[in-house]
């Protein structure tokens, strides 16, 4: 019995369906098939699951979150002994085995491995405004989403006609800040934060208004 | 304690219908397929229906097919069968069991809790 | 479906005798063989899975051996507690099948 080499790791965006492949060859009749979907999960490593099982002509569900969302892509018994997951979650991501047993065929190797990842779009960020907005300031613009996978990368723009940040400024794209030194009355206008993964963008918008001193009365 | 309890046996006419409950208690009933096997009167035992644990997998012997329908209800630790057209050959003690997975030959599985039974008598 | 024959349907021993009870599979089913005791008027009990596990707190006087068709359970020195029916069951394909029995009664 000879499982197939697997592509290595599958992504999919969180909600959508993930397909892991398993295939193998065997010299036997399908007679025998027994088949253990596990997980590693990449956030409790120490805690194998059972995801489903096929024994005896039999489906087993696993462990109690993957109950109504697996499934074999296939009808069983087959030597292609993929599985779907549905409606994935973030917890889902992990190290997926299928170990097939075929009795008599003994031998060869009997595991296949696919890494899974489950890809979330940037959630909402807020942004905010770090310090003073009186002229000749520094300031901090602050720009963060909760979720997302991969870690989103920050982008601030201005909205006016040319988009640039004011001279003064320099930006930190994977922490989402814009630092403006010496802020001046040109600093002022409408800011906006874009969030981006591999699988999605989110904005948020903040208005900068710089306070100039107010004339002395004699 | 690891408990099986079923209930709602009795007396049915031929063509009559039935429903039989399991309580479960003592273990977490919904990570569990659960079966329905049945013993004639001085006679052996016969595998009846399957539920997986979710639902999702169903079977049944070839003889109820059409007729039986299991189901379970995971809030309530609760397993059914809901027996239609009943025959005089489905006269018998119904049995709740419980399903496990072991690890041998790679995986098996084996009726491993059984409950005391409920009769069914169909007669007219 | 897979038949299991028993053999034989019931024998009569005596305390402290061995006793072998045959089970023959119409087909091969790879160990995936269990067996069950049951006292009348109660639910059957498992003593074996696989061939030849003992389940947990089933007396060690109980083994099971055999392959592809035929299958044996001995209970090496027949205890009073042990007269029952004892019954195979295949968990190799569906439908789960039975054998019909085998009594143990008291010589």
């Known amino acids: 019995l000879e499982v197939s080499e697997s592509p290595g790791s599958v992504q999919v965006a969180r909600g959508q369906t993930a397909v892991l492949p398993c295939a193998f060859s065997t010299s036997a009749a399908l007679l025998n098939l027994n088949v253990i979907w596990m997980v590693i999960p990449l956030s409790n490593a120490n805690q194998p699951e059972q995801v489903i099982l096929y024994q005896g002509g039999q489906m087993f569900d696993g462990a109690l979150r993957f109950h109504g969302r697996v499934g074999f892509t296939g009808t069983m018994p087959a030597t292609n002994v993929s599985i779907f997951i549905n409606n994935t979650q973030l917890s889902d991501t992990g190290t997926y085995q299928c170990l097939v047993n075929n009795l008599p065929d003994r031998g060869g190797r009997n595991i296949g491995v696919t890494g899974l990842t489950v890809l979330v779009p940037p959630s909402a960020p807020q942004c905010q405004i770090q310090g003073s907005q009186d002229l000749g300031s520094d300031v901090i613009l602050l720009c963060s989403s909760e979720e997302g996978i991969p870690r989103p990368t920050y982008l601030w723009e201005k909205l006016d006609n040319t988009l640039k940040l004011p001279p003064t400024a320099t930006q930190d794209q994977v922490q989402g800040t814009v630092t403006i030194r010496n802020i001046s009355a040109l600093s002022s206008g409408l800011y906006q934060c874009v969030a981006s993964n591999a699988i999605g963008t989110s904005t948020c918008l903040l208005d900068l208004q710089v306070i100039s001193p107010q004339p002395r009365s004699v | 304690e690891v408990q099986l309890v079923e209930s709602g046996g009795g007396l049915v006419k031929p063509g009559g219908s039935l429903r039989l409950s399991c309580a479960a208690s003592?273990?977490?009933?919904?990570?569990?397929?659960m079966n329905w096997v049945r013993q004639a009167p001085g006679k052996g035992l016969e595998w009846v229906s399957s539920?997986?644990?979710?639902?999702?997998?169903?079977y049944y012997a070839d003889s109820v097919k059409g007729r039986f329908t299991i189901s379970r209800d995971n809030a309530k630790n609760s397993l059914y069968l809901q027996m239609n057209s009943l025959r005089a050959e489905d006269t018998a003690v119904y049995y709740c069991?419980?399903?496990?997975?072991?690890?041998?030959?790679?995986?098996?599985?084996?009726?491993?809790?059984w409950g005391q039974g409920t009769m069914v008598t169909v007669s007219s | 479906a897979i038949r299991l024959t028993q053999s034989p349907s019931s024998l009569s021993a005596s305390v402290g005798d061995r006793v072998t009870i045959s089970c023959r599979a119409s087909?091969?089913?790879?160990?995936?063989l269990n067996w069950y005791q049951q006292k009348p008027g109660k639910a059957p009990k498992l003593l074996i899975y696989?061939?030849?596990r003992l389940q947990t707190g089933v007396p060690s006087r109980f083994s099971g051996s055999g392959s592809e068709t035929d299958y044996t359970l001995t209970i090496s020195s027949l205890q009073p507690e042990d007269f029952a029916t004892y019954y195979c069951?295949?968990?190799?394909?569906?439908?789960?099948?039975f054998g019909h029995g085998t009594k143990v009664e008291i010589k």
């Open positions: 069991v419980r399903s496990i997975i072991v690890q041998a030959l790679g995986i098996t599985s084996v009726f491993d809790i």
């Open positions: 003592g273990f977490t009933f919904s990570s569990y397929s």
């Open positions: 539920i997986s644990s979710s639902s999702s997998y169903i």
């Open positions: 087909q091969i089913i790879s160990n995936h």
């Open positions: 696989a061939a030849s």
């Open positions: 069951q295949q968990s190799y394909s569906n439908p789960r099948t």
